[in-house]
Every structure is written in C-alpha cells, then in structure tokens.
C-alpha cells in the first residue's frame, strides 16, 4: 500500500505479515500521539 | 446506525480510469478502530478485496491490483473514495465499500448495497 | 498471501438438513476468521466473526468453529430462508482473502 511517507513503516512492516490487529494498534497510537502534538503545539 | 452508499459512473470505457465515492451517514468515518473498505465481485463469482484505508490516510492494496488503484478518504465530507486506472472488461463487477473494525474481528460488518460497474470497449 | 479453500463449493438439500461448510487457510490464521452469507443481488452479511462468535440477530441455528488453518460453518436445520451462497474470509492479515463461496441449493 501507500499513505504518505510518514506511514512507510507501518507499510512496510507488512512484508513481514503483521496482522491487521497490530496495524490498527500502530495507526490509532500513531493519531494519538498526533492529536497530543497539536494539543501541545496549540497550547503554546 | 451506520451506512454506506456507493456512488459513480455505472459504464467506464475500456482504458479509462473507473472513480467511485463511499458516503458514510449515522456515524462518524474519523471513528478509531476501523479499516474503510472496498470489496468488487465479477458478474456469477466470488468476493475480491481491491484495498482499505484507515482514517488516517494509511492505504492497504490487494497487491494484484495495486498498481492500478487508489483509495483516499476526505473525512470532511465523510467519504472514501477508489480510483481504478487502466480498466478492462476483466474490471466489469459490482462494487462494495464496506467497514471491518475490531468490534467485529476485521470482517465487514456494514456494508452498500454495490455498484454495477461495465467496462465497455 | 494467505489462500483460502471453501468447500463444497456448492451443496444440496432440504429444509430441516444439517449442512456442514468448511473452509481451511493456507497459514495458521488463530481465530480471524469471518462467515457471511450473500443472496441474489445483495451485499454479504456477517454471520460469524472470531471463527466462533455470533453475530447479532442471527439465528442460532448458525454455528462456526476452529481455529489456526481448519474452520466449519454449521446449520444446524436448514430453513427455507438460508438457501444463499457462503463465503469465508480471513482477517488476520492483509491482503484480505476470500474463500471460493459455497452455493446451498433446494435439492
């Protein structure tokens, strides 16, 4: 697949079968942790 | 309750690129835990997965087709969306968006009700 | 990619029938394994989710289980609304892949 290049390790750890499950984890931890970035940089 | 419609053009012709829009009402496409889903099936066969997308953006192809495809998500307008280049009669098929998420082990617990797609040459 | 191989690819019987449909992967898949049932014209809907778990407002007759690369769909009394076509899937990991269908006729 291809999301932008801030997701090419997660596309990439697909050659080695990661399943669906620990994907969603990786994308949902991943938006997490961008919703608290933008949080914080707009608490500035 | 969730749903989803299909939307797009009913007749593409051959080498042309086929487009289709998912709308997702009655709930929320920026929801975690869900994958967004397109699914195709030729006229008297089986279910093919074309690719997903998550809510983020992160795309998900069927490696047979992925050189030809693309799905984005706009979910401003609570949409997703697949691009198809390249098409041939072999892409003739009722179209199927649906959502797979964690609530359900991954399978696609909704789904539209599918697009005929005719590929002409 | 992960195969999946459904057979029969289609059976007949009769109202009241046990039909037994079974579907085995490729790679051990533990319990990401989903049934669905599709009628003429329609979408497919999610009988069985987990290999085992029933989904809501599906008759209990329905039944699905195994896990790792051998899974069953059971029905147990086959009613006259059930005659559809079947199909497995596995979600454990991507691509997605369907089994081949199982076609439940009227004998």
């Known amino acids: 697949g291809g999301g932008g290049s801030k997701h090419k390790c997660v596309q990439n750890s697909l050659v080695n079968n990661e399943t669906l499950e620990s994907i969603m984890n990786t994308l949902e931890s991943e938006e997490d942790f961008r919703k608290y970035f933008y949080y914080l940089e707009g608490s500035k | 309750e969730v749903q989803l419609v299909e939307s797009g053009p009913g007749l593409v012709k051959s080498s042309e690129t086929l487009s289709l829009k998912c709308t997702v009402s009655?709930?929320?496409?920026?929801?975690?835990?869900?994958?967004w889903g397109w699914i195709r099936q030729p006229p008297g066969k089986g279910l093919e997965w074309i690719g997903s997308?998550?809510?983020?953006?992160?795309?998900f192809y069927n490696p047979s087709l992925k050189s030809r495809v693309t799905i984005s998500v706009d979910t401003s307008k609570s949409q997703f969306s697949l691009r198809l280049t390249s098409v041939t009669a072999a892409d003739t098929s009722v179209y199927f968006c649906?959502?797979?998420?964690?609530?359900?082990?991954?399978?696609?617990?909704?789904w539209g009700q599918g697009t005929t797609v005719t590929v002409s040459s | 990619d992960i195969q999946m191989t459904q057979s029969p690819s289609s059976v007949s019987a009769s109202v009241g029938d046990r039909v037994t449909i079974t579907c085995r992967s490729s790679?051990?898949?533990?319990?990401?394994l989903v049934w669905y049932q599709q009628k003429p014209g329609k979408a497919p809907k999610v009988l069985i989710y987990?290999?085992?778990r029933l989904q809501s407002g599906v008759p209990s007759r329905f039944s699905g289980s195994g896990s790792g690369t051998d899974f069953t769909l059971t029905i147990s009394s086959l009613q006259p609304e059930d005659f559809a076509t079947y199909y497995c899937?596995?979600?454990?990991?991507?691509?997605?892949?369907f089994g081949g269908g199982t076609k439940v006729e009227i004998k």
């Open positions: 790679q051990d898949i533990n319990n990401w």
């Open positions: 009655g709930g929320s496409i920026s929801s975690s835990g869900y994958y």
């Open positions: 987990g290999a085992s």
């Open positions: 649906g959502r797979h998420g964690r609530d359900y082990y991954y399978g696609m617990d909704v």
């Open positions: 899937q596995q979600a454990n990991s991507f691509p997605l892949t």
């Open positions: 997308i998550h809510r983020s953006g992160s795309t």
